[in-house]
């Protein structure tokens, strides 16, 4: 481990490299080769990696095929074309020592002698309750099999098993059916039996899958099921509020509140990247891009990223970036919320960037969070904070990241605590006083019941649990179309958002938050 | 003020190897980048490798991977530049340049530059 | 590898001329654009980094732009002493690389 891997002779040194043979079980004319890479170094780009291929052909002759561009997410495939003679393997040669190849498959011409024996593959489709013995279960070409003897209410399972020559496949997943109750492709959803929609076709990625379940991003309506893609389509529907942050904003889960950044001190800024960006709430249109090369463009009007250094200049010094973000109101945090507009991986590169979270409280104390893997698939990423409970809970005042990589860009971070409820508050309460949520602060204990005054938005409608106004009262607003929800507390904007809507609820003699609907 | 000594020019024969030598002078040698770039006659620049002349580390290009090999010695504010398999290809004036600090960067790109070390590659 | 092209590959120009002289990156390369002036037989001189940023000691009729992909280096009154090749530099990316040079030539 104390080897400089650049001081040290390479395991695979120029020009010829490394190389690695494979034998096929048997030898034939190829019309492609494809081969399958799972990983190659950060050092090399596509074209480096491989520098020759050659094959092996029976009549000892090798045929070089040259340098060839590799990528981890497609084959590579090269047309063999021009070959016209056996082969019996392959030699890949490459200079990078770390390369992993997982497979390599040579594919025959057509009308090859070797495959004058096979026959076409047949089907045999086994059911329980087993299937009369005089029933033809073996399909040839034909891949419909029509069961004429069923009972009514009964239940089916049928397997289907592949048959090659003698040899016989693994059965197949089953498929269950209640004779007369419908199946998964009728176009009628059976929810008994788990289908969320039936758009009566067995695709993939149209909203309604193979299994009659509900895709993510789409929603279903009708018999038989019509899907749409409904996120970032600018309404923000009942069903989308958890998921779409294009369409309603950050979701934040009911008994909690989300505070963003009001300040924001950072490690690496110029006018290019100012810090200040990350204040607020992150921009709705922002998506997470992975495996980026330049951050140029237009990202810092939504998210800071340390500009002021390159990626290779920020490896070789190992310099470390960070960024503050301040809260106007300090909260017991219950968890910090990190927006990505870029994860920090790098083009050509396997690695993932990891942050480190901080919480600072009002005693300018420090609280570990830990080492967090960035990925744009886990976006915002949502750290949660674990308290201590043999140490008195505390107040954090702002959130310190941490990370090695310039090419991590953050549009915003937010303290998520809890709503109406603030532990350090309430375990000062002194005898004869009582937490009161309303206030946020310990009040002393009356027993008169308390109304709340008559809550009046405009441009909203509203939704009450109950006429009366008492304690424990609650009411949904809903802002009309083309207003935006404001929602504060003791005159501090805590959340704008464009829909659907808020509840509020009365506690003590005043409602919880202060709801306006803005055009 | 800030300079860069390169050694002498350098007759090798293919297959040989060469270790030219730049000597820094007139600022902290070890809170810099130092970089190798060579020059083949009426060519274009072509970078060789970067080191962090304070810990050493290195990255190269992979052109040279395996041939070059970039050291330092701090006590003599010195880096050093090693190419094996010499061929007739590499004759070509070999300059070292100094990089950013490693520490607070306040400029990029190559500032300060050795007077060239030639060599020569023929059998 | 990211390519740097340099267009023209050689201008003839006058003293007192104004030359601009463009590099284009065949990848983004963010504003990590290094401009060098060499003359024949010595070393390179830095004279924009980053882009924009003129280098200490450099004349400040020396001026660097661009981002992304496209870069420029103009020289608003050509001097005598400004006849030389140029290169640009990225060091976005490994490897760093060079632009084939623009001889500026008299005219």
């Known amino acids: 481990s104390a080897v400089n891997p650049h001081t040290v002779p390479p395991a695979c040194p120029e020009p010829q490299g490394c190389y690695l043979e494979l034998e096929f079980l048997y030898p034939l004319v190829p019309e492609s080769l494809t081969i399958w890479v799972t990983f190659v170094s950060t050092d090399w780009d596509s074209s480096g990696a491989v520098n020759d291929i050659k094959l092996l052909a029976v009549s000892g002759k090798n045929i070089s095929l040259g340098p060839q561009n590799v990528f981890c997410d497609v084959p590579l495939t090269i047309r063999l074309w021009d070959v016209g003679e056996e082969v019996y393997g392959i030699q890949i040669y490459t200079l990078d020592e770390h390369l992993e190849i997982d497979a390599a498959m040579l594919t025959s011409t057509a009308d090859t002698p070797l495959c004058l024996q096979c026959k076409p593959l047949k089907y045999k489709v086994v059911r329980d309750p087993p299937l009369q013995m005089d029933v033809a279960s073996i399909l040839h070409l034909n891949r419909k099999f029509v069961d004429m003897d069923l009972n009514l209410g009964s239940v089916y399972q049928y397997w289907v098993i592949t048959i090659s020559g003698t040899e016989e496949s693994e059965p197949s997943p089953a498929v269950t059916y209640i004779h007369g109750s419908g199946y998964c492709g009728d176009g009628i959803i059976q929810k008994d039996q788990g289908e969320q929609c039936d758009d009566m076709n067995k695709i993939n990625g149209d909203g309604c899958s193979l299994f009659c379940r509900q895709e993510v991003s789409f929603n279903c309506i009708d018999e038989p099921s019509r899907c749409y893609f409904h996120d970032g389509d600018g309404v923000c529907e009942e069903f989308e509020q958890k998921t779409s942050i294009k369409d309603c904003g950050v979701y934040t889960p009911q008994g909690f509140l989300d505070q963003w950044a009001s300040n924001a001190s950072v490690s690496h800024q110029d006018q290019q990247c100012p810090g200040w960006v990350i204040i607020g709430q992150p921009a709705a249109s922002q998506v997470c891009r992975t495996k980026v090369i330049d951050l140029s463009e237009g990202i810092s009007q939504h998210a800071w990223y340390p500009c002021t250094i390159s990626y290779p200049y920020s490896q070789l010094a190992q310099t470390t970036f960070w960024l503050r973000a301040y809260f106007s109101q300090p909260m017991v945090a219950a968890a910090v919320i990190v927006h990505l507009v870029t994860d920090g991986t790098y083009y050509g590169d396997q690695k993932q960037e990891t942050i480190s979270v901080q919480l600072l409280d009002t005693k300018d104390q420090s609280h570990d969070l830990g080492l967090h893997v960035l990925s744009c698939r886990n976006n915002p990423l949502i750290i949660p904070v674990v308290h201590d409970l043999s140490q008195p809970f505390y107040h954090s005042q702002a959130v310190r990241v941490s990370f090695s990589s310039p090419l991590v860009a953050i549009s915003g971070v937010a303290l998520r605590s809890f709503d109406n409820f603030d532990p350090v508050t309430l375990s000062s309460c002194q005898r004869g006083e009582t937490y009161s949520p309303a206030e946020q602060s310990c009040v002393h204990f009356a027993c008169e019941k308390t109304d709340c005054p008559e809550l009046a938005v405009e441009n909203a409608s509203l939704n009450c649990s109950s006429s009366d106004r008492y304690h424990g009262a609650q009411c949904t607003v809903s802002c009309r179309t083309g207003y935006v929800l404001q929602i504060r507390r003791d005159d501090e904007l805590i959340k704008s958002q464009t829909g659907p809507s808020v509840t509020v609820t009365c506690t003590e003699g005043k409602w919880n938050k202060q709801v306006a609907c803005e055009p | 003020q800030v300079q860069l000594v390169q050694s002498g020019a350098e007759v090798k024969k293919p297959g040989a190897s060469v270790k030219v030598s730049c000597k820094a002078s007139?600022?902290?040698?070890?809170?810099?980048?130092m970089h190798w770039v060579r020059q083949a006659p009426g060519q274009r620049l072509e970078w060789m490798g970067w080191?962090?002349?304070?810990?050493?580390?290195?990255k190269s290009s992979q052109k040279f991977q395996g041939r070059v090999t970039i050291t330092r010695d701090t006590s003599a504010s010195t880096a050093y530049m090693e190419l094996s398999s010499l061929r007739s290809e590499d004759t070509a004036v070999y300059y070292c340049a100094r990089g950013p600090s490693m520490e607070t960067p306040t400029t990029f790109g190559m500032d300060v530059w050795g007077q060239g070390t030639t060599v020569t590659v023929s059998s | 590898d990211i390519q740097m092209t340099q267009s023209p590959s050689s201008v003839s120009a006058s003293v007192g001329d104004r030359v601009t002289i463009t590099c284009r990156a065949s990848q983004g390369i963010s504003r990590w654009l290094a401009w060098y002036q060499q003359k024949p037989g010595k070393a390179p001189k830095l004279l924009i980094y980053a882009a924009s940023s003129l280098q200490s000691g450099v004349p400040s009729r020396f001026s660097g732009s661009g981002s992304g992909t496209d870069f420029t280096l103009t020289i608003s009154s050509l001097q005598p002493e400004d006849f030389a090749t140029y290169y640009c530099q990225q060091e976005n990316a490994y490897p760093f690389t060079f632009g084939g040079g623009t001889k500026v030539e008299i005219k």
């Open positions: 080191m962090n002349a304070g810990t050493g580390a290195t």
């Open positions: 007139g600022y902290t040698f070890t809170s810099y980048a």
